[in-house]
């Protein structure tokens, strides 16, 4: 909407106004070899905004770096045209941009933390939610699967929109949209579970808008390392959301003596960080260089978007990758503490579990251990990559492999350890799990490097799609499915209750190891996709008209 | 159509044990919650048991009441429900009604929509 | 446990009258009441579910209304055979509870 340098609270249409006609401004001095522009200097010769400086800041309108002398811009000026100098005018740069930027990143980290806490107490609640209801457990299923298939539904959907409106809009009327949709269903009438199921799926649509949109405002503001450091932020807040969520829900509950009141937190927290983004995200333009943004929006249809992403090999490698993560996550989340239950009743450490919820314990300890390998995963994926960035071109993908790879060891030896010792299964999943989820930060940075700009919210929906439609979407359901399937040829006892689950439950390896595979493969051609992502940002960068959509 | 029928109830000295068994036809025993409620000579209605199909892991809830003495069971083979009766009390004595839950396939209602004609469980020493 | 209060435990009326029957819950309990008649040795049946859903194959004189804590059972112009003890049943959690009934009686 302007030029962050030079307004990072004021909004509006004159602004954008004046944006575009200090880019097209920009755009001539640019023909004639300036050097820079405005308050937002031409990107160097080192590619698609990818600058070697650390202390680079990635604006609006493409990359600059901080100016050493001078004073501060003035904030709260309408736009970079009325302050640059001229075509070549290297304008100085806010004290408060930095701050500004971080402060955005932490407000869409903060709403993907609500996000899922959002979605994880209702998880914390659901046996209330069952009881109060009279929900079966084929009800459960359909509560969770409405939700998913709505969000994977409304992914690709809101992906369109991202790339074509304001992103920032999109992204509060999401969180408004989900927030007063959970409100609503805490006061949903016993015999209306339908009602019930219908929310969820409206829950599931709102905030698919959150997760397919957000990662790419992130992806505008910084470049480099830094964007590396702050999606790794944005995705620690699924683990911590998801705890927190646990938490919320059964805390809530029990301070105010009725499960309904769980459903009324995170709304009100949702209602205010709405609000937040409205405020203090800035509407920034789609790419380092924004000169290519409003041309592409008007140049690409939603097919050709989808064309491009599926010739785009280290997107579809690393998506099908991130789809055996979604795999492995959903199938272990679902089953490992009914498994490490059953392997308590083999060894005779705990009693055979009549009436639910069996393995509540081990659900808490696997909920914590969730929470903070998250945080491990997403820490130790990212500092990896910083550092093997410096040894080779390929290091995200890699590392993603390499931790994929070594994850697979540790979830197959979860199954060796169970037998007979519960604290070695515990530790196998911990380290398992760590390693699973390094690359959480690192496969949406693989995606911001090799999709453009303003595809990037189309490619986050349709890699979110895929990895909910090929991942946890079905693979409780088929772990579930083999483990019965297992236990109807063998006879009944506790030992093949949990050899059968154990057994069906060794996909999951498997399908890792595949995603493993996907990364090695992903990390053959990130580079070459790489170059070509940059050199479409450069092409388009200087087209021969503006045009405003 | 919906039939529900009780046997089992009679006359025990306090401290001992009475199965009451209730058999149905005309839906779906499977699919569908059962529960046995009771009325004492004279009095009020008290819900006593409930178990959940199949689907809901056949669990099983308990009024305060009689809870560690009195087990509530399905066979979805014979499509019968029971309720096993241990450390009788005066108290017990009662009119036992088996009763259905309707079904709605992905939820139930908690409440009762077909009952039995009862049984009656008289305990006295 | 939800505690359930019927009001009043007996009322005399003539045939053709119209009665309004209370059920007041300890909690906000939403909608979840349902209303049981039970005939003299007799089991008893179901008459209104969720305070107001109407039960197929059961007279439309009987009708339910309320939410909250305040619930009513109406029969418009009561019939003989309407004579009998009228229990109200919460479900909103368990312990499932009932009310202890209302008698209704010829004046």
């Known amino acids: 909407m302007m030029c962050l340098e030079c307004a990072s609270a004021a909004a509006g249409g004159a602004e954008e106004e004046e944006a575009d006609a200090e880019r097209r401004r920009r755009r001539r001095g640019a023909q004639r070899g300036a050097g820079g522009s405005g308050c937002c200097g031409a990107r160097g010769a080192g590619g698609a905004g990818v600058s070697a400086a650390g202390d680079e800041v990635q604006t609006l309108s493409g990359s600059v770096r901080r100016a050493p002398t001078g004073p501060p811009g003035t904030p709260g000026t309408p736009g970079c045209a009325a302050t640059a100098k001229g075509p070549g005018a290297q304008q100085p740069k806010p004290a408060s941009l930095g701050r500004g930027r971080g402060a955005a990143a932490a407000i869409l980290s903060l709403g993907n933390v609500l996000n899922y806490l959002d979605r994880y107490t209702v998880a914390g609640v659901l046996l209330d939610i069952q009881q109060h209801f009279g929900v079966k457990d084929r009800g459960a299923g359909l509560l969770q699967s409405v939700f998913i298939c709505s969000f994977m539904v409304a992914a690709p959907i809101f992906g369109y929109l991202g790339d074509r409106f304001n992103r920032k809009v999109i992204l509060s009327c999401g969180i408004f949209f989900w927030s007063a949709v959970t409100f609503s269903s805490s006061f949903i009438p016993q015999q209306y579970f339908w009602l019930l199921a219908l929310s969820r799926g409206l829950v599931g649509i709102g905030e698919a808008s959150y997760s397919t949109i957000a990662p790419t405002i992130i992806g505008d503001l910084f470049t480099k390392n830094t964007r590396t450091l702050m999606l790794s932020v944005f995705y620690f807040a699924i683990p911590l959301g998801s705890g927190l969520g646990y938490i919320t829900g059964s805390s809530v509950k029990q301070a105010a003596g009725d499960w309904h009141w769980a459903l009324r937190v995170s709304p009100v927290l949702g209602m205010i960080t709405g609000t937040l983004i409205l405020i203090l995200v800035p509407a920034t333009k789609r790419g380092h260089a924004d000169q290519l943004g409003d041309q592409l929006k008007a140049r690409t249809s939603w097919l050709r978007d989808m064309k491009a992403l599926i010739r785009n090999r280290s997107y579809v490698f690393s998506s099908l990758a991130t789809s055996a993560v979604s795999f492995a996550t959903g199938a272990l989340g679902m089953w490992i503490p009914l498994y490490l239950h059953r392997a308590q009743v083999v060894q005779k450490t705990a009693e055979t579990c009549n009436s639910p919820p069996c393995g509540a314990k081990d659900s808490l300890i696997f909920g914590a251990i969730t929470c903070f390998t998250g945080f491990l995963g997403v820490v130790t994926g990212a500092g990896a990559t910083r550092w093997c960035r410096l040894k080779t071109q390929r290091a995200d993908p890699l590392v993603c492999a390499v931790g994929m790879l070594g994850s697979a060891i540790f979830i197959c030896l979860i199954f060796v350890a169970a037998k007979s010792s519960i604290v070695g299964a515990y530790i196998c999943i911990f380290v398992g799990e760590t390693l699973l989820f390094s690359n959480w930060a690192i496969t949406a940075d693989i995606l911001m490097y090799v999709v453009i700009p303003t595809r990037r919210a189309t490619a986050v929906a349709l890699q979110s799609f895929t990895s909910h439609l090929l991942g946890d979407a079905g693979s409780p359901y088929l772990i579930g499915f083999i483990s019965d399937l297992i236990r109807q040829s063998t006879k009944d006892s506790p030992l093949w209750e949990f050899l059968s689950l154990g057994y069906a439950l060794m996909l999951c390896p498997f399908v890792v190891v595949l995603g493993g595979m996907f990364f090695l493969a992903t990390a053959l051609f990130f580079v070459s996709d790489r170059a070509r992502a940059e050199q479409q940002v450069n092409q388009l960068a200087m087209p021969p008209a503006s045009v405003k959509v | 159509e919906v039939q529900l029928v009780e046997t089992g109830g009679g006359l025990v000295r306090p401290g001992s044990s009475l199965k009451l068994s209730c058999a149905t036809s005309g839906f779906t025993f499977s699919d569908t919650w059962m529960s046995w409620v009771r009325q004492a000579p004279g009095k009020g209605l008290e819900w006593v048991a409930l178990?959940?199909?199949?689907?809901?892991?056949?669990?099983?809830n308990y009024a305060e009441s009689i809870k560690g003495r009195f087990t509530i069971s399905r066979d979805d083979s014979k499509s019968r429900v029971y309720l096993q009766m241990n450390t009788l009390r005066d108290q017990d004595t009662a009119t036992y009604y088996c009763?259905?839950?309707?079904?709605?396939?992905?939820?139930?209602?908690?409440?009762?929509?077909?009952w039995g004609q009862g049984v009656m469980v008289t305990v006295s020493s | 446990d939800i505690v359930l209060t019927q009001s009043p435990p007996t009322l005399s009326v003539t045939p053709g009258e119209s009665v309004s029957l209370s059920c007041r819950a300890s909690q906000g309990i939403s909608t979840s009441i349902h209303w049981y008649q039970q005939r003299s040795n007799e089991s008893p049946r179901l008459l209104i579910k969720y305070a107001s859903q109407s039960i197929a194959g059961i007279p439309s004189r009987f009708s339910g209304s309320g939410s909250g804590t305040d619930f009513i059972l109406s029969i418009n112009r009561v019939e003989s055979e309407d004579f009998s003890v009228y229990y109200c049943q919460q479900t909103y959690s368990l312990p499932l509870t009932f009310g202890p009934g209302t008698k209704l009686e010829v004046k």
């Open positions: 009763t259905r839950h309707e079904d709605f396939y992905y939820y139930s209602g908690y409440y009762f929509d077909y």
């Open positions: 178990i959940k199909d199949k689907n809901s892991n056949s669990e099983a």
